[in-house]
Interface confidence: low
């Protein structure tokens, strides 16, 4: 069998709402993927399971099932939507995005997901991490590839 | 209800070609590949290749390359075969076969109702 | 080409008997993603073959459990118990594992 490709492309919107009582910030973020098939029978994409880690902490997850078939030697986009909490112990967060002397509230966010492809049975992972800036301040849509984070350091597996 | 209705038998002369058709119904055409295959009288079944509708990409058993040629209509939801150069030899019935229900594990769930070509002067 | 020969060619079966028709290829038919794609069809006369078995052993859906498949490599076998009426025709088994997919030459099931 032929490889099955998985390209995290970036954070294609974040949608933010707050509750002042409790101090803490909702963020919704869609994602999108390129799934590129190489191989010259149809393969099912069986779920997709993301999380999203700010400062080493899981702030939210998802997972979506049955989401696609993608045929012989094709390539489907596919968005999926990640619901965030950042609140408790990092509601401090919570001043910083809200404060209005500043335009862009830009945090730091790990994104990680992983694909379940599976053909005639056969069931394969592919996981991708990838840092990404995202506005917690206000609500934002992004050109593909324009939240990339770089200049981080990838920890040491 | 998934269904494969295929065209109706063709009588046909030596050396002329015949275009068969396969239309699907209550699916999504486009996602799911079509096989083709051959059974002559009173023999068994021989695997002819596949079409995936949604991209036109086709795969061919080596037999019968050059014989049989693969084609889909996604706005119909109907796939096609043509056998051309015909000879007494393609005398058969033609299914054609689609994996909708076991896409994960098999090759043909979903079978047509056959099409009966008779070559002959 | 893997060649998928079925013994016997013909079954002679009373109704209620067990039957049971072997299908060997002539190679190993385990992919290289560690499946075996052997699978079992009955085709009844005038009609379009019907898929029993996939993956050596599992039946399709709204197959009777009387069916059964079996086996690994190169040696399978579909048991039926209980013959009844309804299961009369050709048996083909079909191995999909390596290209081109290629069927047994079939196996009849009669009445004796």
């Known amino acids: 069998p032929r490889s099955i490709d998985v390209k995290y492309i970036g954070v294609k919107s974040a949608y933010v709402s707050y509750d002042v009582q409790k101090r803490t910030i909702y963020l919704n973020i869609t994602n999108t993927l390129n799934i590129t098939n190489n191989n010259y029978y149809s393969v099912e994409v069986e779920n997709i399971t993301a999380q999203v880690q700010f400062s080493k902490t899981v702030i939210g997850k998802a997972r979506l099932n049955n989401i696609t078939i993608i045929g012989p030697l094709d390539m489907k986009q596919i968005d999926y939507t990640v619901p965030t909490v950042i609140a408790e112990e990092m509601s401090y967060m919570y001043d910083f995005c809200t404060l209005i002397s500043i335009k862009v509230h830009n945090i730091v966010l790990m994104m990680q997901v992983t694909v379940t492809t599976t053909y005639f049975g056969h069931s394969e992972q592919i996981s991708q991490e990838r840092y990404q800036y995202v506005d917690c301040g206000r609500n934002t849509t992004y050109q593909l590839g324009q939240s990339e984070y770089l200049n981080v350091l990838q920890p040491q597996q | 209800q998934v269904q494969l209705q295929q065209s109706g038998p063709e009588l046909v002369k030596p050396g002329a070609s015949v275009k068969i058709s396969c239309k699907a119904s209550g699916y999504r055409f486009t996602s799911y590949y079509i096989h083709w295959v051959k059974q002559r009288p009173g023999q068994g079944l021989e695997w002819i290749g596949w079409i995936y509708p949604g991209n036109g990409i086709t795969n061919y058993n080596e037999k019968f390359k050059g014989k049989a040629t693969l084609t889909a209509d996604t706005s119909s939801s109907t796939a096609y075969m043509q056998l051309s150069s015909l000879t007494s030899e393609d005398s058969a019935v033609y299914y054609c076969?689609?994996?909708?229900?076991?896409?994960?594990?098999?090759?043909?769930?979903?079978w047509g109702t056959g099409t009966t070509v008779t070559v002959s002067s | 080409d893997v060649l998928m020969t079925q013994t016997p060619l013909s079954l002679p079966v009373s109704l209620g008997d067990h039957a049971s028709i072997s299908c060997r290829s002539g190679q190993s038919i385990v992919h290289s993603n560690g499946n075996t794609y052997l699978e079992w069809y009955l085709q009844k006369p005038g009609q379009s073959p019907k898929l029993l078995i996939y993956k050596v052993s599992n039946r399709f859906s709204g197959v009777p459990d009387r069916f059964s498949g079996s086996g690994s490599g190169t040696d399978f076998t579909l048991k039926i118990s209980r013959v009844e009426a309804e299961d009369l025709g050709i048996y083909y088994c079909f191995q999909g594992s390596h290209v081109p997919w290629t069927f047994g030459g079939g196996t009849k099931l009669e009445i004796k």
């Open positions: 076969a689609s994996p909708y229900y076991g896409i994960r594990n098999c090759y043909f769930d979903v």
